[in-house]
Amino acid sequence: MKVLQEPTCVSDYMSISTCEWKMNGPTNCSTELRLLYQLVFLLSEAHTCIPENNGGAGCVCHLLMDDVVSADNYTLDLWAGQQLLWKGSFKPSEHVKPRAPGNLTVHTNVSDTLLLTWSNPYPPDNYLYNHLTYAVNIWSENDPADFRIYNVTYLEPSLRIAASTLKSGISYRARVRAWAQCYNTTWSEWSPSTKWHNSYREPFEQH
């Protein structure tokens, strides 16, 4: 049994880090493998993560960490029984993937304006809270070509767009994701999408 693709890990910079790797053949990750992780410092306690399958030869592990802070560094040991398959290290604050925003809502009761709001996935005491920017993806369920991205570079978790920028009388979906430039993070996963029916009054044309 060998590791084909070494573990790569990302952290939500709060309490969960996720590591993924690939084995050289079909593997029952949860019964055959264990990922041990330990805070690098003195005699800190070692923790064990039981991986799950992620495709035939792929494994994923969700590492629960006690309040990740910037000085934390972890050693990672991947074991198959008594055999050490791989040894590495991981600094959560240098491999941040933010949590996905939540509670995406489309408010259609503002005259001819769509107001999209969502929740910041971090509490105010977390450094990322004031450093997230967002991308909002809106697409038509009827027309795959009608697909757009709005970059929200201000801190407020909201976006206003004129309803008239979208087609009237059809259904749209929206989703949002986040990233933080200050930590050069990757993008978060997309939030669950929300659906609405876009309708607005066409401006009266005089001839």
Partner: antibody, heavy 121, light 107 residues
Framework: QVQLQESGGGLVQPGGSLRLSCAAS????????LTWVRQAPGKGLEWVST????????LYADSVKDRFTISRDNAKNTLYLQMNSLKPEDTAVYYC??????????????WGQGTTVTVSS | DIQMTQSPSSLSASLGDRVTITCQAS??????LAWYQQKSGQAPKLLIY???RLQTGVPSRFSGSGSGTSFTLTISGLETEDLATYYC?????????FGQGTKLEIK
């Protein structure tokens, strides 16, 4: 506003014990890691110990490990430092410190006024 | 452990001068560095974090720069109230380690 108030310092003989307390207010105590930093007379700052927010992880400088124990009571908003087997070189002003954000380690935006520990026979 | 070497250990400057204090890390710490000011008989005060981010309420004459192993604190126009000892602190890894301090005196 954030307030940190240390207490429990005093004069103790070598080999003796003391327990320092740091009463906190003005922030969500249970969300932050908290730290003790000390300063010997006329010397620089030295990191002593940190306890993470939920109290499951404690970290110590080599100079105090196995002698000092950091703990916290999130219900009482209080941080503690139990100091045993004290040595003359532990003589210092002891500060408790809170980081600016819950996931920063040593970016201490708030400090107590300090409590003095003197170890002498 | 990461060693932090601060220089100079003391310096004397005139009001209005531009003052620079440097901190050298024994290994790369990216931008995981904070600067503190400590006046006599007082607790330290955070000036800069993240290598270059100015803490709220700190005068803009203070600035921090550098990354990796070399960092600088600059005071661009020294004022009487800046008489203090300045410390750098690496927050890249445990144990956290301070520089030995720079005592700033006014000529």
């Amino acid at each position: 506003q954030v307030q940190l108030q240390e207490s429990g310092g005093g004069l103790v003989q070598p080999g003796g014990s003391l327990r320092l307390s740091c009463a906190a207010s003005g922030f969500t105590f249970s969300s932050y890691s908290l730290t003790w930093v000390r300063q010997a007379p006329g010397k620089g700052l030295e990191w002593v110990s940190t306890i993470k927010a939920r109290g499951g992880t404690t970290l110590y400088a080599d100079s105090v490990k196995d002698r000092f124990t950091i703990s916290r009571d999130n219900a009482k908003n209080t941080l503690y430092l139990q100091m045993n087997s004290l040595k003359p070189e532990d003589t210092a002003v002891y500060y408790c410190a809170k980081p600016l954000y819950s996931n920063l380690a040593g970016d201490f935006g708030s400090w107590g006024q300090g409590t003095t520990v003197t170890v002498s026979s | 452990d990461i060693q932090m070497t601060q220089s100079p250990s003391s310096l004397s400057a005139s009001l209005g001068d531009r003052v620079t204090i440097t901190c050298q890390a024994s290994q790369s710490i990216s931008s995981y560095l904070a600067w503190y000011q400590q006046k006599s008989g007082q607790a330290p005060k955070l000036l800069i974090y993240g290598g270059s981010r100015l803490q709220t309420g700190v005068p803009s004459r203070f600035s921090g720069s550098g990354s990796g192993t070399s960092f600088t604190l600059t005071i661009s126009g020294l004022e009487t109230e800046d008489l203090a000892t300045y410390y750098c602190l690496q927050v890249y890894s445990w144990p956290l380690t301070f520089g030995q301090g720079t005592k700033l005196e006014i000529k």
